[in-house]
């Protein structure tokens, strides 16, 4: 009876996500058979989050809307380890929008999920950000510095990275 009600709860939870994500990949967390964490297929997972590389080229605003439709946001990078995980799935000749912008052009950078911007945990390329007109952040590869962030015009279409919390069922 207990297992049956647990299964019913899981099914109803899965149904919630089905409109955005028809397929989930789930793994058992820890030793308890009752704890499963899921990411939409074919998203990748790292720690408590799921990531999706969007290869369609869109402006920053349209990229964020695209992530939002999937129940996600443009990626917020909180640690070096997280960035190191993300770059494994990126192409060196492409640029990808981050969930980081400065809409007022006053160098008050803000993350889309309201995570406080911490200057000590940023990975700007040297000399960046360097232009008050360029109010959105990308991550890209420079041969001299490898992967880092750069500021660019928000309306210029780029690829993007979406991030959402893992789904626990």
């Amino acid at each position: 009876n207990f297992m049956y009600s647990k299964t019913v709860k899981r099914l109803s939870k899965l149904r919630e996500y089905q409109q955005y994500h028809p397929s989930l990949t789930c793994v058992m967390e820890g030793k308890d058979i009752e704890d499963w964490s899921c990411c939409p297929t074919p998203w990748t997972s790292f720690q408590s989050s799921c990531y999706f590389i969007s290869t369609g080229m869109q402006s920053w605003t349209k990229s964020q809307k695209n992530c939002s439709v999937m129940g996600a946001d443009l990626v917020v990078i909180n640690t070096r380890e997280e960035q190191d995980f993300i770059i494994q799935n990126l192409k060196r000749n492409s640029s990808y929008f981050l969930g980081l912008s400065d809409p007022g052009g006053r160098r008050h950078w803000q993350w889309v999920d309201q995570t406080p911007y911490n200057e000590n945990v940023t990975f700007w390329h040297s000399g960046e950000p360097n232009n008050l007109d360029e109010r959105c952040a990308i991550i890209n590869f420079r041969s001299s510095e490898e992967w880092g962030w750069n500021d660019i015009h928000c309306h210029v279409p780029q690829k993007s990275i979406c991030k959402m919390k893992k789904i626990y069922i």
Partner: antibody
Framework: EVQLLESGGGLVQPGGSLRLSCAAS????????MSWVRQAPGKGLEWVST????????YYPDSVKGRFTISRDNSKNTLYLQMNSLRAEDTAVYYC??????????????WGQGTTVTVSS | DIVLTQSPDSLAVSLGERATINCKAS??????????VNWYQQKPGQPPKLLIY???NLESGIPDRFSGSGSGTDFTLTISSLQAEDVAVYYC?????????FGGGTKVEIK
Amino acid sequence: EVQLLESGGGLVQPGGSLRLSCAASGFTFSTYTMSWVRQAPGKGLEWVSTINSGGDNTYYPDSVKGRFTISRDNSKNTLYLQMNSLRAEDTAVYYCATYRPYYYGSVLDYWGQGTTVTVSS
Amino acid sequence: DIVLTQSPDSLAVSLGERATINCKASQSVDYDGNSYVNWYQQKPGQPPKLLIYGASNLESGIPDRFSGSGSGTDFTLTISSLQAEDVAVYYCQQSDEDPWTFGGGTKVEIK
């Protein structure tokens, strides 16, 4: 007072090249993103190119990508548009304009008087 | 690309009367409460002049008989009391996503 003065237009044969210039004064040119916009005879406006203040980022629509190159010399307060492999459909008045950001978008707030490019055999 | 469709193509209005121009975008050009549509005026033989930015903000130095409204995909430029010097072609433009695109223009004349 902001002033933008385009030059370099003229008559050129299809497949030929032209280099347009836009001399800027009355503002700190080196801190402004700049754009070119064109207008074919009796037609509407078409964005042609944009370059950021440092000159390291340039943008084009598909219609001119690979044929036109925007550049700037901040020491001379001058914006350029190098146009190669010209076609009849490139015939237009070419305007340079200053770019002003507006949150995630932008406006083109000051425009020059334009220079006329005619591509014809 | 985002297509902007202006209507009407031309408009004849009596002096002192209201002129209304519409601009419809093929997809939303809004984000976070702002609309990325601008309006320009172009008189014969002159370059375009910025009137309205962000759908409804009046550019400095522009008479307040000009106003803009709308959001999402539908935008309007209104001249509340047409003056002789307002005879021109008016263009909407979106700056939400490259390539920036312009509407086809609306010619405003005196009736």
